[in-house]
Amino acid sequence: CDLPQTHSLGNRRALILLAQMGRISPFSCLKDRHDFGFPQEEFDGNQFQKAQAISVLHEMIQQTFNLFSTKDSSATWEQSLLEKFSTELNQQLNDMEACVIQEVGVEETPLMNVDSILAVKKYFQRITLYLTEKKYSPCAWEVVRAEIMRSFSLSKIFQERLRRKE
């Protein structure tokens, strides 16, 4: 399963789409910056087996997909870009699911790293709470867009390390 290679390209396409989605000048949003507590340690360890690593990445993509599929998101972003972004994420999710099924026969370790997946879930809960508290303002969405771009970039490093391990 050559997921890291294909996923890395998909990740890059998703990042480009995210970058294009900006609607307002981020310079007006500086005071809305927020510490979402990206679970960096979940993407630092080399202890993961491949299937476990993929399951953590899958959770991150799934949560991003959920976040950008809300009606509040649809009201904020340009529709055609949002659709392309969602399609890209959906493709990545499908690739990952197929890859995990392939890996299960190869590895004897548990399929999922429950603690890591929970950490990713809680991270996205903090993002959703922030948006709610900020009443889904344009600046709040701009801060979240920047945060998701950063988390995608950090997970990309994780994927590259995973590819080197193969």
Partner: antibody, heavy 121, light 107 residues
Framework: EVQLVQSGAEVKKPGESLKISCKGS????????IGWVRQMPGKGLEWMGI????????AYSPSFQGQVTISADKSISTAYLQWSSLKASDTAMYYC??????????????WGQGTLVTVSS | DIQMTQSPSSLSASVGDRVTITCRAS??????LNWYQQKPGKAPKLLIY???SLQSGVPSRFSGSGSGTDFTLTISSLQPEDFATYYC?????????FGQGTKVEIK
Amino acid sequence: EVQLVQSGAEVKKPGESLKISCKGSGYSFTSYWIGWVRQMPGKGLEWMGIIDPSDSDTAYSPSFQGQVTISADKSISTAYLQWSSLKASDTAMYYCARHPGLNWAPDFDYWGQGTLVTVSS
Amino acid sequence: DIQMTQSPSSLSASVGDRVTITCRASQSIDGALNWYQQKPGKAPKLLIYFASSLQSGVPSRFSGSGSGTDFTLTISSLQPEDFATYYCQQSFDFPLTFGQGTKVEIK
């Protein structure tokens, strides 16, 4: 290794134009903003303005608005600061520094070495 | 614009002394404050960000505190390499603004 490398010292006459540069390496250039800071001889730090290299959006300090132009060329990971007509009072050390944008990360964590601009007739 | 006022503007201290520099903002900036150290002929160096977070590679003798309008940089035990000028800077809103600097000299 993250680096911001600035162009060399310049000696100019009043009324001349000038463009100094700041080249980033060792990180994703479009993921960070680049700010410019002036330090006149024996004085403190003054923020001039900032650019988002991903789309060349800029913001200026009111003190420098209309006096300088900040630009960037993301294809060569370089930001610029330029004057169309220099004055003697522009004599200073100019620093570029990277800023994390809207991310919760250290501000101005890496700085260029500085470009000394001397304007004298 | 948000004005940043540092005090004192200069101070004399000895190696081993505890040194405190204060910075006051003209309006609340939450915790959006950074501290920099600058030595003659060198670029500024980030010490503390978001009021109290120690930048990677900076010795633990440096610490920052405060929120709202009043902030403090503390050097718990001054070392010979700490003699320099220190600047605070607000990163709450544009235009970004620096304090006028505090020069720490050898007594």
